[in-house]
């Protein structure tokens, strides 16, 4: 399955929007910094077949979409930017979903892919717990925004590598 060219443009737009969403200086939130243990090894693109990589990317975007679709998120960000960001993620989800279905049809997830999906889920669990512990403070959201920018950059790079493999 070839992801449409608009997909990579959507990735870039999502990153730009997320950058624009920053409301407070990252430096004023240094005390709140946290290592969420992003599962880099799941995004290096070496141990995967393309199909499996797309499933993991889908999980990544889906969890990001869910994180920014909460009431707490709505209260934290400028509404029009948040809506545009969510729209970009939703479009990416549609592209990836179509690819997962096209590549293998609806079937059981390959065993080697199961732990990668769980690793992504656990990463977002750590982010969710951090926000809860910090009572969704502005600095906590700023730390999370910066973290998601980093993880989306990894996703974008993996997708570039997948396109080069084609």
């Amino acid at each position: 399955c070839d992801l449409p060219q608009t997909h990579s443009l959507g990735n870039r737009r999502a990153l730009i929007l997320l950058a624009q969403m920053g409301r407070i200086s990252h430096f004023s939130c240094l005390k709140d910094r946290h290592d969420f243990g992003f599962p880099e090894e799941e995004f290096d693109g070496h141990q995967f077949q393309k199909t499996q990589a797309i499933s993991v990317l889908h999980e990544m975007i889906q969890q990001t979409f869910n994180l920014f679709s909460t009431e707490d998120s709505s209260a934290a960000w400028e509404q029009s930017l948040l809506e545009k960001f969510s729209t970009e993620l939703y479009q990416q989800l549609n592209d990836l979903e179509a690819c997962v279905i096209q590549e293998v049809g609806v079937e059981e997830t390959p065993l080697m892919n199961v732990d990668s999906i769980l690793a992504v889920r656990k990463y977002f669990q750590r982010i969710t717990l951090y926000l809860t512990e910090k009572k969704y403070s502005p600095c906590a959201w700023e730390v999370v925004r910066a973290e998601i920018m980093r993880s989306l950059s990894f996703s974008t790079n993996l997708q570039k590598r997948l396109r080069r493999k084609d």
């Epitope: 889906q62 969890q63 609806v106």
Partner: antibody
Framework: QVQLVQSGAEVKKPGASVKVSCKAS????????MHWVRQAPGQGLEWMGE????????IYAQKFQGRVTMTRDTSTSTVYMELSSLRSEDTAVYYC????????????WGQGTLVTVSS | EIVLTQSPATLSLSPGERATLSCSAG???????LYWYQQKPGQAPRLLIY???NLASGIPARFSGSGSGTDFTLTISSLEPEDFAVYYC?????????FGQGTKLEIK
């Protein structure tokens, strides 16, 4: 509010198959994995597997591999769990439970569907 | 597979007393992925505590959770009549996800 409504009780003969449905409402159906958990009479809870309603990919517990099939219909926001080659030990209440994160993990359950396997 | 063993199987106490329920894991479970559920007869399980020690929405403060590694505890500080039920610990730290066999909390 989030609601998961399951199909009614079933009685099946050994060797037959059963298909239980779980209709979701009150949230975006394709955003969350749906899990199936069963409970034999007087026994504990047992995780069977999960399905991503967005693209339909599944993850099954090894114990049920080859006998369980989870599917979904996005047009009706419904997930299905089919169990084949039924035996008496499969007599249980089958629950669907919605995934999520933090306080949302298995925070929402269907009411349960009793499947009785008897000759 | 991570086996969760709950003890005791049955706990007989009176309202007002303190209840301590244990959950022992066969191998280490990250505390972020250890949950507790309450189940009453004829009902679906209900989320009580998530990530070892966090109270789910609407759960009274008399419930608390603690632990790490392989040993986890659910404590009910002062039992109310509605607390008598079966309690399950659950992990989703690794596949397959598992539940303990349950502790039945009954009125003495």
């Amino acid at each position: 509010q989030v609601q998961l409504v399951q199909s009614g009780a079933e009685v099946k003969k050994p060797g037959a198959s059963v298909k239980v449905s779980c209709k979701a409402s009150g949230y975006t159906f394709t955003n969350y994995w749906m899990h199936w958990v069963r409970q034999a009479p007087g026994q504990g809870l047992e995780w069977m597997g999960e399905i991503n309603p967005s693209h339909g990919r599944t993850i099954y517990a090894q114990k049920f591999q080859g006998r369980v099939t989870m599917t979904r219909d996005t047009s009706t926001s419904t997930v299905y769990m089919e169990l084949s080659s039924l035996r008496s030990e499969d007599t249980a209440v089958y629950y669907c439970a919605r995934g999520g994160l933090g306080p949302a993990w298995f925070a929402y359950w269907g009411q349960g569907t009793l499947v009785t396997v008897s000759s | 597979e991570i086996v969760l063993t709950q003890s005791p199987a049955t706990l007989s106490l009176s309202p007002g007393e303190r209840a301590t329920l244990s959950c022992s894991a066969g191998s280490s479970v990250d505390s972020s992925y250890l949950y507790w559920y309450q189940q009453k007869p004829g009902q679906a399980p209900r989320l009580l505590i998530y990530s070892t020690s966090n109270l789910a929405s609407g759960i009274p403060a008399r419930f608390s959770g603690s632990g790490s590694g392989t040993d986890f505890t659910l404590t009910i500080s002062s039992l109310e009549p509605e607390d008598f039920a079966v309690y399950y610990c659950h992990q989703w730290s690794s596949y397959p996800f598992t539940f303990g066999q349950g502790t039945k909390l009954e009125i003495k």
